[in-house]
């Protein structure tokens, strides 16, 4: 922490201008008004403090806001952004598309992905929800950052909304997210035809159920691997061999090139060999002729 | 990210003079302030001077009369004419943006030594 002394008369600041560059540490600390500071953030940005320098500016303004800052001085923080831990941001309240732009841009090559989320986060709250506004900035300015949202924040997204997100977008949204998702890009795209009604829906099918895959399947879709292997487990495993056929169209033949991967491996493991072997891939592993399939949890001898 | 190469250094005795250069890669230096800071053994890291992206410009105390700092932005380059050099000049002296002094991001810098 810098040392409190007392501001020598001529230093005393009545503006925040490039002067203050010259100005010691211990002197921002002693003659730099936080009130001052906060009225002219907006200067901020412009002006090349160093790296110390602002360290000293953001403890004037977390001393004048402990409670967190207003969106007023949030606006206008350019580089001091790149200062904020989440635990900072957290104390925010941020309703403006114009100060998420802003701060987007300033953390673009940084190191910065907890705090961006923690920021994409407090708008959502503030906003109400994740609006069209909010997706569409999102998607412009920080792609892929919509997964930064908890399942609970993106259960706040309308199904109407669901068109803007590209798929690129959701590259890195975990299973948990897709689960929220995908209902609602079921809602969004139901009254389109097939074939147009798959490429929209295909992004988010890692969070659909067997039902909604095996529905596919009879719909000559002719699924990619990249798109399958994203399933869950769980919509996997039930499909039959033949339904796999169907879903994977000619794109059949890279299940020999996943056979080791999940959710392949897993759903190899739970066919027949000799249904495997109609697939003509040379698939192993599968149950052999002759074995019975036990489902200890339906207690049934299934044949 | 920004590249900033410093030159124009070197060992001169006290009251000559040096010219020191701030070449920037890209188009950074339109529209922003530029500063000259430098850095002696084992002191803090200080600014110089300063030019606005007006072309105003503001000097440290310790400099004022003798130093003097300008800019060419179709050329993306700034420079520090340095007058009446003293032992306590001495340093390595760098230049920076807003941006770039913000991240801790500094070019090599170039050392100015002042010794007879």
């Known amino acids: 922490d810098v040392e409190r002394t007392t501001c020598p008369p001529e230093k005393e600041v009545h503006e925040i201008d490039e002067s203050l560059i010259f100005y010691k540490k211990r002197e921002l600390e002693a003659c730099v008004d936080a009130a001052l500071l906060a009225a002219q953030m907006d200067r901020v940005d412009a002006i090349p403090f160093t790296y110390e320098q602002l360290d000293v500016l953001k403890h004037k303004l977390d001393e004048l806001y402990p409670q967190g800052y207003p969106e007023s001085v949030i606006r206008h923080l350019g580089h001091l952004f790149l200062k904020m831990s989440p635990e900072d941001i957290r104390k925010w309240n941020v309703t403006s598309l114009e100060t998420l732009k802003a701060l987007l841009k300033v953390s673009k090559g940084h190191e910065m992905s907890a705090q961006v989320a923690t920021l994409i986060d407090r708008v959502v709250v503030g906003r109400g929800q994740l609006d069209k506004d909010t997706v569409d900035t999102l998607t412009a300015f920080c792609p892929g950052c919509l997964c930064s949202l908890s399942p609970e924040r993106l259960s706040s997204v309308p199904p109407s909304v669901i068109g803007a997100v590209r798929p690129q977008d959701l590259d890195t949204c975990g299973p948990r997210q897709l689960d929220v998702l995908y209902p609602k890009a079921r809602l969004a795209f139901q009254n389109m035809s097939g074939s147009e009604y798959f490429v929209k829906i295909r992004p988010f099918l890692g969070g659909a159920p067997t039902e909604d895959v095996k529905a596919l399947s009879q719909q000559n879709v002719s699924m990619d691997l990249a798109t399958f292997m994203k399933l869950r487990r769980e919509a996997v495993l039930p499909l039959t061999v033949a339904e796999v056929q169907k879903l994977l169209g000619p794109h059949v033949e890279g299940l020999k090139v996943e056979e080791q991967h999940s959710p392949v491996r897993d759903w190899i493991l739970k066919q027949r060999q000799d249904d495997l072997d109609t697939l003509g891939l040379g698939l192993q592993g599968g149950i052999p002729n002759g074995y019975l399939i036990l489902d200890l949890s339906v207690r049934e001898a299934l044949s | 990210q920004v590249q900033l190469v410093e030159s124009g250094g070197g060992l001169v005795q006290p009251g000559g003079s040096l010219r020191l250069s701030c070449a920037a890669s890209?188009?950074?230096?339109?529209?922003?302030?530029v500063a000259w800071y430098r850095q002696a053994p084992g002191k803090e890291r200080e600014a110089v001077a300063v030019?606005?992206?007006?072309?105003?410009?503001k000097y440290a105390d310790s400099v004022k009369g003798r130093f003097t700092i300008s800019r060419y932005n179709a050329k993306n380059i700034a420079y520090l004419q340095m007058n009446s050099l003293k032992p306590e000049d001495t340093a390595v002296y760098y230049c920076?943006?807003?941006?770039?002094?913000?991240?801790?991001?500094w070019g090599q810098g170039t050392q100015v030594t002042v010794s007879s």
């Open positions: 920076n943006t807003a941006r770039g002094a913000a991240v801790d991001s």
């Open positions: 890209g188009s950074i230096f339109s529209g922003n302030a």
């Open positions: 030019i606005t992206r007006d072309g105003d410009t």
